[in-house]
């Protein structure tokens, strides 16, 4: 007996041929000896089946000796055996018929979890192995769960059900829905304005949601809510900001705040949550602001930043075009009776200088 | 492409010196901290300095601090590490890499060099 | 110095398993910690850096995970190229300080 495997809402052709390349009769019937369709001369002829609306035959091959059924749209109960009785002989085909579907929608935020769920036919024992875009095999049976959902995982998952030694390929489209970064950090100098940027990581029609961004400055002792917004249509509306610092954001897509001055007391990390309509769970960037502030007193040339550095970083201060006066892996340097000339403040780590602030010491008469 | 390839390797008694070099081609090597690494007979990987893209830091572990002396020559794209004072301890395979600075907050090696051997024995 | 205390020391596992190795930093290191693998006479390789970040190349079988002092490396599914000896290393603070090693064999 022929295998044929099939996918729930497709085609597919069941092949008959007899040794005569003509047009004889032929009959299609199912394991309980409905007819399904056969035919009458050049005409085609449908029986009582269920298959009725959905069944079909290639007239234009029947000449040839082949009486194709072709079962549209199919289901998972078409799964039977389909006989073809053709010139006394009688052929028979199991036709196998599954259906792979995401549990939920196919959008999904980042650290969810994903089941892939197997429609079969009773008394069918398949085996299921999918590979994710960035290449990652899972395999099982009735069920496949990924957990952790990871921004690569979003594209085209391509799932092989293998039966009988025969198999049939899926492929579903899977959308993670994930900022384009979970953290980054921006360097300014005292005064300089502060650009915030958080691009969204996939595109959808519509986009409607809220989100926030509590901040918590390195001198605060707790975090406070910047601003609230309302997402509609990749619209962007504030619906409260607090008034210090005065905080503007972007009406249009990616979400863009900015700050009016780098300031020490806003120096810190900062936490963007974004609630999408339909969907449990947030997505969240995390933002990091170093302010550096080079001034001087009387006869002390001071350099200080304030915010989150990695403990590697390196604070110096130098005469322009000289050797670092001083140089430490600490949050502030200073000199004392500073030579006159450009001083440069300098915050840099092993790879590059990280930001960079200049300072005029005139001389003492 | 991106390579690494040390060299200076050799057999030394304990208490002389050794100057390994590393060639580093394929990128720019002044934008880049450069690392020692060692892997010792039968024994894990250890860490053993750090030099600064400027060349103007550089950071040992305190097995080797006061003996090996990590230094770059940006012109000639060149990491060395000068060993005094060596030690039958010191016998590693000595690997150099590169290491990568995202935004002064992550850091890794992703670029190694296949070694050089340092064997001291009497 | 900050001292990495890496667990288990050997594993013996088959292909197809799930393997973590863990690793523990005697104080808060953040996020600084990346995962090398290393195989006999080749140089190491980046699994994961910044805890949990897979780099450019690696299979997504390997994955990173945890903060702070604790840190785990995860091998969904063992590959018979994936037996190796697997190192963490603390790059949050000088002096750099690698764990004691995890050599995985095949069972």
């Known amino acids: 007996k022929k295998v044929v495997l099939g996918k729930k809402g497709d085609t597919v052709e069941l092949t008959c041929t007899a040794s005569q390349k003509k047009s004889i009769q032929f009959h299609w019937k199912n394991s309980n000896q409905i007819k399904i369709l056969g035919n009458q001369g050049s005409f085609l002829t449908k029986g009582p089946s269920k298959l009725n609306d959905r069944a079909d035959s290639r007239r234009s091959l029947w000449d040839q000796g082949n009486f194709p059924l072709i079962i549209k749209n199919l289901k998972i109960e078409d799964s039977d055996t389909y006989i073809c009785e053709v010139e006394d002989q009688k052929e028979e085909v199991q036709l196998l018929v599954f259906g792979l579907t995401a549990n939920s929608d196919t959008h999904l935020l980042q650290g969810q979890s994903l089941t892939l769920t197997l429609e079969s036919p009773p008394g069918s024992s398949p085996s299921v192995q999918c590979r994710s875009p960035r290449g990652k095999n899972i395999q099982g049976g009735k069920t496949l769960s990924v957990s952790q959902l990871e921004l690569q995982d979003s594209g085209t998952w391509t799932c092989t059900v293998l039966q009988n030694q025969k198999k049939v390929e899926f492929k579903i489209d899977i959308v993670v829905l994930a900022f384009q970064k979970a953290s980054s950090i921006v360097y300014k100098k005292e005064g300089e304005q502060v650009e915030f940027s958080f691009p969204l990581a996939f595109t959808v029609e519509k986009l409607t949601g809220s989100g926030e961004l509590w901040w918590q400055a390195e001198r605060a002792s707790s975090s406070k809510s910047w601003i609230t917004f309302d997402l509609k249509n990749k619209e962007v509306s504030v619906k409260w900001v607090t008034q210090d610092p005065k905080l503007q954001m972007g009406k249009k897509l990616p979400l863009h705040l900015t700050l009016p001055q780098a300031l020490p007391q806003y120096a810190g990390s900062g936490n963007l949550t974004l609630a999408l309509e339909a969907k449990t769970g947030k997505l969240h960037q995390e933002v990091n602001l170093v302010v550096m502030r080079a001034t001087q007193l009387q006869k002390n040339l001071t350099c200080e930043v304030w915010g989150p550095t990695s403990p590697k970083l390196m604070l110096s201060l130098k005469l322009e075009n000289k050797e670092a006066k001083v140089s430490k892996r600490e949050k502030a340097v200073w000199v004392l009776n500073p030579e006159a000339g450009m001083w440069q403040c300098l915050l840099s780590d092993s790879g590059q200088v990280l930001l960079e602030s200049n300072i005029k010491v005139l001389p003492t008469w | 492409q991106v390579q690494l390839v040390e060299s200076g390797g050799g057999v030394v008694q304990p208490g002389r010196s050794l100057r390994l070099s590393c060639a580093a081609s394929?990128?720019?090597?002044?934008?880049?901290?450069m690392h020692w690494v060692r892997q010792a007979p039968g024994k894990g990987l250890e860490w053993v300095a750090i030099?600064?893209?400027?060349?103007?830091?550089?950071y040992y572990a305190d097995s080797v601090k006061g003996r090996f002396t990590i230094s770059r020559d940006n012109s000639k794209n060149t990491l060395y590490l000068q060993m005094n004072s060596l030690r039958a301890e010191d016998t590693a395979v000595y690997y150099c890499?590169?290491?990568?600075?995202?935004?002064?907050?992550?850091?890794?090696?992703?670029?190694w060099g296949k070694g050089t051997t340092v064997t001291v024995s009497s | 110095a900050i001292q990495m205390t890496q667990s288990p020391s050997s594993l013996s596992a088959s292909v197809g398993d799930r393997v973590t190795i863990t690793c523990r930093a005697s104080?808060?290191?953040?996020?600084?910690l990346g995962w090398y693998q290393l195989k006999p006479g080749k140089a190491p390789k980046l699994l994961i850096y910044?805890?949990?970040s897979l780099q450019s190349g690696v299979p997504s079988s390997f994955s990173g995970s945890g903060s702070g002092t604790d840190f785990t490396l995860t091998i969904s599914s063992l590959q018979p190229e994936d037996f190796a000896t697997y190192y963490c290393?603390?790059?949050?603070?000088?002096?750099?300080?690698f764990g004691q090693g995890t050599k995985l064999e095949i069972k």
């Open positions: 890499t590169r290491e990568v600075a995202l935004e002064g907050y992550y850091y890794y090696m992703d670029v």
């Open positions: 290393l603390q790059d949050y603070n000088y002096p750099y300080t």
């Open positions: 910044a805890a949990s």
């Open positions: 394929g990128f720019t090597f002044s934008s880049y901290g």
């Open positions: 030099i600064w893209y400027d060349g103007n830091n550089k």
């Open positions: 104080q808060g290191i953040r996020n600084g």
